[in-house]
């Protein structure tokens, strides 16, 4: 017996196509690219039917349904917009992922355009099915930092958002009797990492050993402008405290450390990371001007409680900044060798300041970043960390401030931040 002539489904075809179908003949129903066979609420690539002995087909011809990629996945620190009207998610529809500008930017600079493929997946030319990654934008404050042509020697009040990477690190070491409390500065490197000087995070309880303070004793404040008003600041506890393994307390060689924050901090106008330099041993060139910010909390008689809780006046309640020129290694070395004492300015350090002195150099709290504008990338880069000063401390004539040369440690920093020991797998832009 012959079976009735078959009509192929819309957006589909029947194979083989014959004038007559007899008992035991089989046909395969398939759909055009971007469509799938829909039968009994089931979706399949092809569907086979057979001409039965009684002249009827074993099943009805199924329909061809357009492939639907479904709602696109959300993007961390990004958003998705539909290029097609009515927010269509079907075959050949387009969407565009973008990052939360200006705080995040897309890794690999991809277009972020994804098309709904015939396979039912959102696909990008470069990344294929993988989602783009939004990385924090570093070294680009929402407010432009002052141009570096003028020599501003004295400390200035920083406007909110000028130094969005600036962190206040508060340490309360309860292993001491009474509890020991102190401050330092740091610089945000990513949503979860703070760069600082090792001596800020070293417990002074034991002298000839470098013992980091317990992570439980560390609090980091970000987006802080005035220590009397912490309402707008983000405070975070530490997940890990990592001192450079070769930190030397005798001469402060390798004075660099990292704090991993317990939770990633949300970035915004007042909280943004600083860029790391390229790994090169030269460090910043002499006469280059850099900026250092700090609250100038250098009065040992002021306790943490007074500042953090009641906001008692310190050297400065409001974040200050100062502009300083890099000094040649030879000049700095000579200035320290001419003084009594075994001060060693190593290759892991550089100096900055003015020959004529000026207490402005005090404004950079220990661990704060000495930042220089990189003309090539148009980003601010952390070239140094406030480390130490001579016996006269800051501001004396021909006693330069000594900074950790960050470019010597870039590989170590990346290694630590991306090590399996890191609490989370965190990506930061290199």
């Amino acid at each position: 017996n012959e079976c009735p002539k078959l009509q192929p489904p819309v957006y589909g075809k029947i194979e083989p196509s014959q004038a007559v179908y007899s008992f035991k003949d089989q046909v395969l129903v398939s759909c055009d690219t971007g469509y799938k066979v829909l039968k009994d609420n089931g979706v399949m690539d092809t569907f086979q039917i057979e001409c039965l002995k009684d002249g009827a087909w074993s099943n009805k011809i199924p329909t061809c349904k357009i492939v639907d990629c479904g709602a696109p996945a959300g993007l961390k620190h990004g958003l998705v917009t539909f290029s097609t009207r009515n927010n269509l998610t079907t075959y050949k529809s387009e969407i565009r992922y973008s990052c939360q500008q200006p705080y995040y930017k897309m890794l690999h600079n991809t277009t972020g355009v994804y098309t709904c493929s015939a396979h039912g997946t959102w696909t990008n030319e470069v990344l294929k099915r993988s989602l783009p990654t939004c990385l924090p934008v570093c070294g680009q404050p929402s407010r432009a930092l002052p141009n570096l042509v003028k020599r501003i020697i004295g400390g200035r009040n920083a406007e909110l958002g000028l130094f969005p990477w600036q962190a206040l690190i508060v340490v309360e070491d309860t292993s001491r009797v009474p509890n020991d409390k102190w401050f330092g500065s740091g610089a945000l490197l990513s949503e979860s990492w703070i760069l600082t000087a090792a001596h800020v995070l070293r417990s002074q309880r034991r002298d000839n050993t470098v013992i980091p303070v317990s992570k439980e004793h560390v609090t980091v404040y970000l987006g802080l402008h005035d220590v009397r008003d912490k309402s707008g600041a983000v405070n975070s506890s530490a997940a890990r405290v990592i001192l450079h393994p070769d930190f030397n307390i005798q001469n402060y060689n390798h004075d660099i450390a990292l704090v991993q924050l317990q939770k990633p901090v949300p970035l915004g106008a007042h909280v943004m990371p600083i860029c790391l330099p390229r790994p090169e041993p030269e460090g910043p060139a002499p006469h280059m001007l850099g900026l250092v910010a700090g609250w100038g909390i250098s009065n040992p008689n002021v306790t943490v409680d007074e500042i953090i809780l009641s906001g008692t006046r310190t050297l400065s309640d409001v974040l200050q900044y100062v502009k300083l020129p890099v000094v040649s290694h030879a000049e700095c070395k000579a200035s320290y060798e001419s003084r009594s004492g075994n001060y060693s300015v190593t290759e892991n350090m550089f100096c900055a300041g003015y020959y004529e002195g000026g207490k402005d150099t005090c404004l950079g709290d220990s661990g704060g970043a000495f930042v220089i504008f990189d003309e090539m990338s148009q980003h601010w880069v952390a070239q140094g960390l406030v480390s130490w000063g001579g016996p006269e401390e800051c501001g004396s004539k021909q006693v330069y401030g000594v900074y950790t040369k960050v470019s010597n440690y870039v590989d170590w920093l990346w290694e630590e931040m991306n090590s399996p020991r890191a609490v989370r797998d965190l990506q930061v832009e290199r």
Epitope: V171, R176, V177, P178, N179, D180, K181, W182, H199, Q204, R205, R206, D207, N208, T209, I211, I249, Q250, N251, Y252, N299, P300, N301, V302, T303, S340, G341, N342, Y343, W388, P391
Partner: antibody
Framework: QIQLVQSGPELKTPGETVKISCKAS????????ITWVKQAPGKGLKWMGW????????TYADDFKGRFAFSLETSASTAYLQINNLKNEDTTTYFC?????????WGQGTSVTVSS | DIVMTQAPLTLSVTIGQPASISCKSS???????????LSWLLQRPGQSPKRLIY???KLDSGVPDRFTGSGSGTDFTLKISRVEAEDLGVYYC?????????FGGGTKLEIK
């Protein structure tokens, strides 16, 4: 080259205040704490306590809580011991020494005499 | 407070002969960090004390190797293999493990 230089001898009357200085040189002052030690004439050494030179937080032994105060002038790399309301039993030599637990370099000592 | 007991109070030694000083603490000086904070100091007549040994057995730079420190827990010893004239003075042991830190009463080394 590491040195701790203390201020000179003091002669005081009971009830007065004395402030002894200890100037450090040859190392980064804020790297090490400063410990204060008392030595009565012909007697042994007594640990009075120490001050963290980075945080400025002092720690006192029980016998030295109250009238005794440790302080710092970080910019001058100097630590101070102040004794208020002096008593005759405060007549002794006071030493400053580097570190909280190092005690590796010592000042020359400052002799305080309390006499009416 | 930890009591540090030194013995003997006085030690008379002939130059070139060995000497040994004992220091006992009322509690173990092993710290939670695995280190034992026990130092030996020498105070020569009319001078400030000078550290000779730290962490039980580590010799300070410039200290002659005739000095050796040993011990653990609560019992510690300072030995001088051959006493020299410059060694006379009062020797103190000191513990920096338990707060408040404490000195021993001192041992006076005399030359016979």
């Amino acid at each position: 080259q590491i040195q701790l230089v203390q201020s000179g001898p003091e002669l005081k009357t009971p009830g007065e205040t004395v402030k002894i200085s200890c100037k450090a040189s040859g190392y980064i002052f804020t790297s090490y704490g400063i410990t204060w030690v008392k030595q009565a004439p012909g007697k042994g050494l007594k640990w009075m306590g120490w001050i963290n030179t980075y945080s400025g937080v002092p720690t006192y032994a029980d016998d030295f809580k109250g009238r005794f105060a440790f302080s710092l002038e970080t910019s001058a790399s100097t630590a101070y011991l102040q004794i208020n309301n002096l008593k005759n039993e405060d007549t002794t030599t006071y030493f400053c020494t580097r570190g909280g637990d190092a005690l590796d370099y010592w000042g020359q000592g400052t002799s305080v005499t309390v006499s009416s | 407070d930890i009591v540090m007991t030194q013995a003997p109070l006085t030690l008379s030694v002939t130059i070139g002969q060995p000497a040994s000083i004992s220091c006992k603490s009322s509690q173990s000086l092993l710290d939670s960090d695995g280190k034992t904070y026990l130092s030996w100091l020498l105070q020569r007549p009319g001078q400030s004390p000078k550290r000779l040994i730290y962490l039980v057995s580590k010799l300070d730079s410039g200290v002659p190797d005739r000095f050796t420190g040993s011990g653990s827990g609560t019992d510690f010893t300072l030995k001088i293999s051959r006493v020299e004239a410059e060694d006379l003075g009062v020797y103190y042991c000191w513990q920096g493990t338990h707060f408040p830190y404490t000195f021993g009463g001192g041992t006076k080394l005399e030359i016979k």
